[in-house]
């Protein structure tokens, strides 16, 4: 026999959680003339949804409640002089990681 | 020392994967006359992204490559015909689960 209350709890716990997303380092850092290798990194960002929000809500959103910066070592290639060859260097890039997420109300109703 | 090729592989493997999403059973089954308990269930659906697509793509999307139907036991409450009150019954609802996902090209470029 399925415990139906357990299913509800499962939805609450696992529907809006930190998940793997790939981010383009160039776009994230707004460093447009620089090529990074790898071009993308895996970060934890809040994902999923809040389809059955416990709050009395018009719109329930999955948002980060705890954010940290993590450093990733990558290869950076950028033009330095002239028209051939890119200057290579290893660098640490800081990217936001979401550690905890919450379903929050965007526009609550009176009911 | 960080293996930069490993980071690229990590992005490829984990950025677009089956993830937990909550779905409203009523909306999923288009059964507006019925109340379900729980109202939402946890399903696996493709999520994440394909920010650094390996294909030469204008738009790379994370889509399911293997889909299965799974049955979930829920409590169903429907209006009784002709009389007041709700008819309660345990029922199995079939929901789509994504088992495998792929980054696919929506609009490839020649370059």
């Amino acid at each position: 026999v399925v415990d139906l209350n357990l299913l509800t709890e499962e939805v609450r716990l696992y529907s809006c959680t930190p998940r793997n997303f790939s981010v383009s380092i160039r776009e994230e850092l707004k460093r447009t003339d620089t090529i990074f290798w790898p071009g993308c990194l895996l970060v934890k960002r809040c994902g999923g949804n809040c389809a059955c929000c416990l709050h009395n809500c018009n719109e329930c959103q999955c948002v980060p409640s705890k954010v940290t910066k993590k450093y990733h070592e990558v290869l950076q290639l950028r033009p330095k002089t002239g028209v051939r060859g890119l200057h290579k260097s290893l660098t640490d890039v800081a990217l936001e990681h979401h550690e905890e997420c919450d379903c929050v109300c965007r526009g609550s109703t009176g009911g | 020392v960080v293996d930069l090729n490993l980071l690229t592989e990590e992005v490829r493997l984990y950025s677009c994967t089956p993830r937990n999403f909550s779905v409203s059973i009523r909306e999923e089954l288009k059964r507006t006359d019925t109340i379900f308990w729980p109202g939402c269930l946890l399903v696996k659906r493709c999520g994440g992204n394909c920010a650094c697509c390996l294909h030469n793509c204008n738009e790379c999307q994370c889509v399911p490559s293997k889909v299965t139907k799974k049955y979930h036991e829920v409590l169903q409450l429907r209006p009784k015909t002709g009389v007041r009150g709700l008819h309660k019954s345990l029922t199995d609802v079939a929901l789509e689960h994504h088992e495998e996902c792929d980054c696919v090209c929506r609009g490839s470029t020649g370059g």
């Epitope: 460093r31 447009t32 003339d33 090529i35 290639l77 002239g82 028209v83 060859g85 890119l86 | 030469n56």
Partner: antibody, heavy 119, light 112 residues
């Protein structure tokens, strides 16, 4: 298919100004450095300008520095060359070319647009 | 500036023959990163230049294997093993290792 189409070439008087355009298609324009190269009437090739994928890096040889400005609009997938204080020796066919991803070579060139500087 | 000198100015060949074009620089064209940015381009009549060889000896995609590049330091060569009609045109060498980047004066490959 990668395509580069130059336009804007014209007959201009010495000291005048002109802006050339290069419309890019078939690739993600914002990921690539771009260049202008010119070919004089005696068929000699000369590098004119280069710009980084995001537009903040630019390179000019001394022959055009201070007179020419290379720019790009990634929303329009277009490369530009603004030329001022034009001289007769600027008369040439102007080609736009795409820099390879790691700037190892220039892989695709447009068909060119002609600038004539003469009084 | 790095001066790139191409020889010969004109190269008459018969179809099927081997052709060899020389390009010499007046100084070493090794980039500060250790690479040598020496390229060969072919310009056919009425067309824009097309890349054949980059970094001395690497064939660009789609370029037939009858084209080969070699050399180092200041002395470089483009060889065409068996000349075909479609190979006719003007060949330019180019160095991008030093600023300003410079082209050779061109070698015209024509039918004997």
């Amino acid at each position: 298919e990668v395509q580069l189409v130059e336009s804007g070439g014209d007959l201009v008087k010495p000291g005048g100004s002109l802006k050339l355009s290069c419309a890019a298609s078939g690739f993600t324009f914002s990921n690539y450095g771009m260049s202008w190269v010119r070919q004089t009437p005696d068929k000699r090739l000369e590098w004119v300008a280069t710009i980084g994928s995001g537009g903040s890096y630019t390179y000019y040889p001394d022959s055009v520095k201070g007179r020419f400005t290379i720019s790009r609009d990634s929303a329009k997938n277009t490369l530009y060359l603004q030329m001022s204080s034009l001289k007769s020796e600027d008369t040439a066919m102007y080609y736009c070319a795409r820099q390879a991803p790691l700037w190892d070579y220039s892989d695709y060139w447009g068909q060119g647009t002609t600038l004539t500087v003469s009084s | 500036d790095v001066l790139m000198t191409q020889t010969p100015l004109s190269l008459p060949v018969s179809l099927g023959d081997q052709a060899s074009i020389s390009c010499r620089s007046n100084q070493s064209i090794v980039h500060s990163n250790g690479d040598t940015y020496l390229e060969w381009y072919l310009q056919k009549p009425g067309q824009s230049p097309k890349l054949l060889i980059y970094k001395v000896s690497n064939r660009f995609s789609g370029v037939p294997d009858r084209f080969s590049g070699s050399g180092s330091g200041t002395d470089f060569t483009l060889k065409i093993s068996r000349v075909e009609a479609e190979d006719l045109g003007v060949y330019y060498c180019f160095q991008g290792s030093h600023v300003p980047p410079t082209f050779g004066g061109g070698t015209k490959l024509e039918i004997k």
